[in-house]
């Protein structure tokens, strides 16, 4: 009949049982084995299932399962006894906290539920199973109770613009195991952490330091706490408040001409910004505020202006952090005195503008004259230079023309000075220097070669490749050039009088 196992001993000290135990531990017995977990992890307050399942051969039975707490250095403490016939017995220390798992129950399952796990439950547990007929088995597991942290955020001292590195906030979280504390913010700062170990938990404190500036005002600073016992990170947000006070300025005097006798609705507005929000105070430096002047916070409203409203006005801005002043001089003008001054001002402006315009015009004329003279002189130099070159190369050019085939199209490409490249613009270079081009070998080509080249290029160009206007110009240029040459057997020969240089309308030297 079922018998239960004690905490200190697992059955009568009969040598039969000892043999059975030895056999089951050494694996020589064909008995089953206990299935359990090395570690069972629960969150504080949850129920912990302590698993212990006997997987045996058919016909084997579990008579009793005894659970005990067996922390090192302490005596075993009876937890519960699960008997195949008598049911569950819970020791007084665990009364009401140990239960069998809900049905359906397997007779080979010796698992128990430890309700509402507390930190003190953390430790080693042993499951001792009496099986029939195999004998007794035991297995150990470790219960780990996670204590989720309850983070707290403590703001640092009041932040003020101009302070150095200052504590913005500290965040503390205590749990088991030690939680992780980090910061999530757009604000630039530095963090430092420290931890304190307690007997069953650890507290972690992280501090966030920053150099306060007004741009940080209203920015969130979030403490993020991570822990295996939390389904998601815990976040505590602190809104930064940085005390500051901006320089004060006064608006309303941008157009002095509006401040004239009789004007209605004139006002001065004091501009500043601060945390905490500042208060405004208006005074007049050279006496009390004139009657009728309304003070409405940052605004000073005037009745219809009179000369007595002229004076120096001071806006005094202050908050708990600091105070600022800004002063302006109001000069209320008399419209009659003003009109003469205004006419003089316009006349003066017109004269100044006229003088500047005349000077600019003169400058332009001088530049144009100088440029035209420069170009004329340059052209003369070029003409002289070309005449000299033509005279020197003329005989040589005629000799070369005779020595070639009669059909100019059959000449090798290297004899052509300017190449069309299949593009009409190649004939339109505005620099006259491009006409007498030097080949790599240093050879130059005479007028005759250039004319033939132009003729050849014209034939090569497709009819639609250039604009109509350009085609006409090119044709006209060739016609004029042809007046100085005679065509014989497909070649051009210079007329006896054709010693001149012709520059076509586009500036090409022929």
């Amino acid at each position: 009949m079922p018998l239960s196992l004690g905490a200190e001993m697992w059955g009568p000290e009969a040598w039969l049982l000892l043999l059975l135990l030895l056999a089951s531990f050494t694996g020589r017995c064909p008995a089953g084995e206990l299935e359990t977990s090395d570690v069972v992890t629960v969150v504080l307050g949850q129920d912990a299932k302590l698993p212990c399942f006997y997987r045996g051969d058919s016909g084997e039975q579990v008579g009793q399962v005894a659970w005990a707490r067996v922390d090192a250095g302490e005596g075993a403490q009876e937890l519960a006894l699960l008997h195949s016939k008598y049911g569950l017995h819970v020791s007084p220390a665990y009364e009401g906290r140990v239960e069998q798992p809900p049905p359906p129950r397997n007779p080979l399952d010796g698992s128990v539920l430890l309700r509402n796990a507390v930190q003190a439950d953390e430790g080693e547990y042993e499951c001792r199973v009496s099986t029939f007929p195999a004998g007794s088995f035991q297995a150990r597991l470790r219960l780990r109770v996670l204590v989720p942290p309850l983070p707290s955020l403590n703001p640092g001292p009041a932040l003020e613009e101009g302070q150095g590195l200052t504590l913005a906030a500290s965040c503390t979280a205590e749990g088991s195991p030690a939680p992780s504390v980090t910061w999530d913010t757009e604000v630039k700062g530095t963090t430092s952490s420290r931890s304190f170990k307690h007997s069953r938990s650890a507290a972690v404190t992280s501090e966030f330091h920053l150099v306060p500036s007004r741009s940080m005002n209203g920015q969130p600073l979030t403490c993020v706490v991570s822990h295996p016992g939390l389904l998601q990170d815990q976040r505590i947000t602190h809104i930064l408040h940085v005390s500051f006070l901006a320089e004060a300025s006064v608006r309303g005097l941008e157009d002095q001409n509006l401040w004239h006798i009789g004007r209605e609705g004139a006002m001065l507005k004091c501009l500043s910004e601060g945390q905490p929000p500042p208060s405004y105070n208006w005074t007049r430096l050279d006496g009390p505020l004139p009657s009728g002047v309304r003070v409405d916070g940052d605004t000073l409203g005037f009745p219809p202006l009179t000369t007595e409203h002229s004076g120096i006005y001071v806006c005094h801005v202050s908050n708990e952090f600091s105070s600022r002043d800004s002063q302006v001089t109001v000069d209320v003008l008399d419209p009659q005195e003003d009109s003469g001054k205004q006419v003089d001002l316009v006349s003066a402006s017109v004269v100044v503008v006229g003088v500047i315009a005349a000077l600019l015009f003169c400058l332009l004329v001088v530049v144009v004259v100088l440029m035209s003279r420069y170009h004329r002189r340059k052209a003369q130099q070029m003409t002289q230079k070309y005449e000299e070159e033509l005279t020197l190369t003329r005989e040589n050019s005629i000799r070369r023309l005779h020595s070639h085939h009669t059909d100019p199209r059959s000449q090798p490409e290297e004899s052509v000075g300017l190449r069309a490249e299949g593009h009409p613009d190649s004939l339109k270079d505005n620099s006259s220097c491009s006409v007498m081009s030097e080949e790599p070998e240093g050879r130059s080509y005479s007028t005759l070669t250039t004319v033939r080249e132009i003729e050849t290029q014209t034939e090569l160009l497709s009819p639609g490749s250039g604009r109509a206007e350009e085609e006409e110009d090119q044709d006209e240029g060739i016609k004029q050039a042809m007046n100085h040459f005679v065509q014989e057997n497909g070649t051009l020969r210079a007329k006896p009088t054709g010693n001149g240089i012709y520059i076509n309308g586009r500036g090409h030297l022929v």
């Epitope: 009949m1 004690g6 009969a14 039975q61 017995h89 029939f132």
Partner: antibody, heavy 119, light 107 residues
């Protein structure tokens, strides 16, 4: 070695009560069930009831329900069986018995206590 | 309650004989069955547990078998000291019940 040592023989009158003790040694008394079995002269074995000391509650055979009380004192590792309203047919040898493997059967027996009910 | 019917109630045999005693349960008891030997004036002695497991110190001529409802105790070769009364016991459920016993006598 597991030993179950019972109290000595008793002679009782009909209607009286008898309390037999069984002191256990050699194993963890609290966790193992103690059974009480009786044997009338020339008769077979008859189970009366059993208890697991740590549980404190006992199971009884229907025949003896209300007349028998089985208790255990963990401090002295002693089990007790009290039978009330004794009749002549209660004359028998009363045995306490335990087991080698928790939860199963009967393996160890006390030497027995003879209770004689006679007027 | 589970009734245990043991047969025969008595048996005469000689030393060296092979003897078989049977025990039948009124309902299935798996292998929750034990066999005891009792000699006159002595407390019972456990021979076999779990229907077939020989207890420590018990000679190997004793063997048990069966499961469910039908069980047997066999003595392969009777020895003089084996003449006694034999009981079966079921401990599958409460109340625990014994068989009526088999008295083994010398022929």
């Amino acid at each position: 070695e597991v030993q179950l040592v019972q109290s000595g023989a008793e002679v009782k009158k009909p209607g009286a009560s008898v309390k037999v003790s069984c002191k256990a040694s050699g194993y963890t008394f609290t966790s193992y069930d103690i059974n009480w079995v009786r044997q009338a002269p020339g008769q077979g074995l008859e189970w009366m009831g059993g208890i697991i000391p740590i549980f404190g509650t006992a199971n009884y055979a229907q025949k003896f329900q209300g007349r028998v009380t089985i208790t255990a004192d963990e401090s002295t590792s002693t089990a007790y069986m009290e039978l009330r309203s004794l009749r002549s047919e209660d004359t028998a040898v009363y045995y306490c018995a335990s087991t080698a493997v928790a939860g199963f059967g009967i393996d160890y027996w006390g030497q027995g206590t003879l209770v004689t009910v006679s007027s | 309650d589970i009734q245990m019917t043991q047969s025969p109630s008595s048996l005469s045999a000689s030393v060296g004989d092979r003897v078989t005693i049977t025990c039948r349960a009124s309902q299935g008891i798996s292998n929750y069955l034990a066999w005891f030997q009792q000699k006159p004036g002595k407390a019972p002695k456990s021979l076999i547990s779990a229907a077939s497991s020989l207890q420590s110190g018990v000679p190997s001529r004793f063997s048990g078998s069966g499961s469910g409802t039908d069980f047997t105790l066999t003595i392969s070769s009777l020895q003089p000291e084996d003449f006694a009364t034999y009981y079966c016991l079921q401990h599958d459920s409460f109340p625990i019940t014994f068989g009526g016993g088999t008295k083994l006598e010398i022929k």
